[in-house]
Interface confidence: low
């Protein structure tokens, strides 16, 4: 499929001008190659009318130009003094006319309306309101006022001052007679339809002395704004329909076959399943404007989108609308990254997030998509050292591996962590990407004790058991804080006995804290990595208490877990007597008290080899 994109249809009137924008992927070659505009012939050829190399056909002499904007990846063809002879099929393209790097454009030039003398022209957008003003003389002040529409050869009554309203206008038209001082009546038509366009006649009086005024109503269908975005990237539709519809339900829909427009999202809570996890409808401003963000763009997202306002939350005749034609460029600069990551309860995931490598200094963010209230994405962590309170000790955003990718690690997984997450930066907003975390059946791979208590001034040894599948990985211990996880020295204690059917390649790696101080309290992670690519992690919380008896502590898997009645305070908010643990997604289910769960019982993410779009926590 050609990556060149432009308007499919351009409509204008004789004597007017058009401006046609064509988009291309802004690669180095494309930026400098020849751009052209040609007219397709009946036998299939395409005759150049204008090109970026200076050629202008005699048909276009003095009335057309072509301008390239290499930094935007666009070029613009302007054509003036249009005539009906200009109607036809054209191509805008790159390189040689016959090579196929082009886009088909249909140009339709129609004859201007043949208007009667003294005709007032009203040009109004579809769905909006028009007020047709009708002056009259004093002698007709007390006489019947009426508005007719010319249908073929005959005028058809639309509304009059005796109370008649044509059924086609019911509920959206009124006739206002101004105060006695003004010799004027007005007809106001709301929610304009395309079928309302045409010639109107307003009249005061019915005899030969009646006053008449001609009006021509042109109802404009909005020209779609062209939007050219990369596959896997994101798009934002900004919709400003005006303050008069500020309190009316808003929608974004995608045109399917014919006139159907399938709702993508609306303010009444409807959302198309295909956009689950990757769409936000931003809150409205006071003037009723709003925007819709769609991430993780797919080929099938391409098409015509309309935003509008209607009490039903969907497109109806007379809805004020805005339109966009979205083209999804498959020659994307955004790299493939897994769209699904799988982990097990108690385990972990490591998510790779792409960003624009030109913006390495931008702030990186990770947020959790929520479907409530038209979609929202509360931030969970950023690269500036901020972590949402309920995620302390189990979430970290790392700048590694760098060069266009950062890593997010989430451990102590529960079923409530399943969902859609967005990677984003404060730089290039087109580089928002979406990943779905799925929680699957299984046991964590890494085994660590539960929460551990250390004694002030003594030595603490905490074990982490690595199965043989990680024999070739670098194993580490680190202390978690808001800015990341600071590596600590650890000792390889030889093969682990924690795994059944696992050979000598399994490993027990211990963290030793000598002369424990209050500052040692906190979250510790053990994990595996390969170079700058992180795999699975497991977390353990170390509490520090006063000395009771001398000696050092060597914690085993069995004895480190908190007893059911033991009071354990940690930054995951394990509550007294294990009654409730603060859960980051508590309000998603509107529970009164969260379920008890083990805070730190190891980590694992499985790798699903069935799809290149899926990633496990240790897929490296």
């Amino acid at each position: 499929k050609s990556p060149i994109f432009g308007p499919e249809e351009v409509n204008s009137v004789e004597g007017n001008s058009v401006s046609i924008t064509c988009y291309y992927p802004p690669t180095s070659v494309n930026r400098h190659t020849r751009k052209y505009w040609c007219r397709q012939g009946a036998r299939g050829g395409c005759i150049t009318l204008i090109s970026s190399e200076g050629y202008v056909s005699s048909k276009y002499a003095g009335r057309a130009n072509l301008t390239n904007f290499p930094e935007n990846g666009t070029f613009v063809v302007n054509i003036a003094q249009l005539s009906q002879d200009d109607s036809g099929r054209y191509k805008c393209g790159l390189g040689i006319n016959s090579r196929g790097l082009s886009f088909d454009v249909s140009l339709e030039v129609s004859q201007g309306p043949g208007l009667l003398n003294d005709t007032k022209v009203y040009t109004v957008d579809l769905g909006r309101t028009v007020t047709i003003n009708c002056p009259f003389k004093t002698e007709n002040a007390q006489k019947r006022k009426s508005l007719y529409k010319q249908i073929g050869l005959y005028p058809v009554l639309v509304i009059d001052s005796s109370g008649y309203v044509n059924p086609n206008y019911t509920g959206r038209i009124r006739l206002d007679i101004q105060g006695t001082g003004q010799l004027l009546f007005s007809v106001v038509i709301n929610q304009l339809r395309l079928s309302d366009a045409g010639q109107y006649l307003c009249q005061a009086g019915d005899d030969s002395n009646s006053n008449k005024k001609n009006a021509d109503l042109q109802v404009l269908k909005p020209e779609p704004e062209l939007v050219y975005e990369d596959l896997r990237g994101s798009v934002t539709f900004h919709c400003a329909l005006g303050p008069e519809v500020a309190n009316v339900a808003k929608f974004l829909c995608r045109q399917s076959s014919g006139e159907n427009c399938d709702v993508v999202v609306n303010t009444l809570g409807k959302r198309a399943p295909a956009f689950e996890g990757r769409i936000l409808l931003n809150p409205q401003d006071k003037d009723g404007s709003f925007s819709v963000v769609i991430t993780g763009l797919r080929k099938e997202d391409a098409g015509r989108y309309l935003c509008g306002a209607h009490s039903d939350g969907q497109l109806q005749e007379g809805s004020p609308i805005q339109a966009w034609q979205l083209f999804v460029n498959e020659e994307s600069t955004i790299p493939r990254s897994p769209t699904v990551v799988k982990g097990v309860a108690g385990g972990s995931v490591a998510v790779l997030c792409p960003y624009n490598r030109k913006e390495s200094k931008s702030i990186k963010y990770w947020c959790l998509w929520e479907g409530a209230q038209n979609g929202r994405c509360p931030l969970l962590v950023d690269s500036e050292g901020w972590v949402k309170a309920q995620y302390e000790g189990r979430l970290s955003l790392l700048e590694e591996p760098g060069n266009g990718t950062f890593t997010v690690i989430l451990n102590q997984l529960t079923s409530r962590d399943a969902g859609f997450y967005w990677c984003l930066t404060n730089g290039d907003t087109l580089w928002r990407t979406t990943v779905e975390i799925k929680i699957i059946e299984g046991e964590p791979n890494l085994k660590v004790p539960g929460n551990v208590t250390a004694v002030l001034g003594e030595t603490l040894k905490v074990p982490c058991h690595f199965p043989c599948k990680f024999s070739s990985y670098e194993k580490y211990w680190c202390k978690w804080n808001n800015t990341g996880c600071q590596a600590l020295p650890s000792q390889d204690e030889g093969p682990s006995k924690a795994f059944v059917n696992c050979d000598e390649n399994s490993r027990l790696v211990s963290l030793t804290l000598n002369l424990v101080t209050r500052a040692d309290e906190g979250w510790y992670w053990c994990g595996v990595k390969q170079g700058h690519f992180y795999g699975e992690t497991a977390a353990v919380y170390v509490a520090v208490e006063e000395r009771k008896a001398a000696g050092s502590r060597d914690v085993s898997l069995a004895k480190a877990d908190a007893a059911p009645d033991e009071k354990v305070l940690d930054s995951g908010f394990r509550e007294i007597e294990n009654k409730a643990i603060q859960d980051p997604r508590l309000f998603a289910e509107e529970k009164a008290v969260a379920d008890t769960r083990d805070q730190a019982d190891g980590s694992r993410a499985s790798v699903d080899s069935g799809s290149s779009e899926e990633q496990g926590g240790s897929s490296r």
Epitope: L280, N282, P283, V293, Y365, C367, Q373, R376, C377, P378, L379, W386, K388, A389, L424, T425, N426, G427, T429, R432, L586, F587, E590, K591, A592
Partner: nanobody, 124 residues
Amino acid sequence: EVQLVESGGGLVQAGGSLRLSCAASGSILSTNDMGWYRQAPGNQRELVARISRGSSTIYTESVKGRFTISRDNAKNTVYLQMNSLKPEDTAVYYCNADMLPSDLSHGYYYRDYWGQGTQVTVSS
């Protein structure tokens, strides 16, 4: 700049009552969950109570039946009514809110903000 300002703390005798307030100031489009946390000397900060935008609530076990959290969405304010106070309730109380500031140029992303804290001392 978005800020949370707490008020209502002070010294009270055991069995007494206090009402804490926390108001958000600055340019805010929307407020999501709001809550109160506390930190006693030598302890970690712990959840006291949280309230969702739809007014669903959660309390830590030790304050259930004594403390009530409420909110006024129009004023972006959260309250904590504390009755039957005990000496072990002595702590610095922090307000926390998940808010969408209107100056977030890069999109529609809530993040949480913390107040400076207000001291509550319960004497026996």
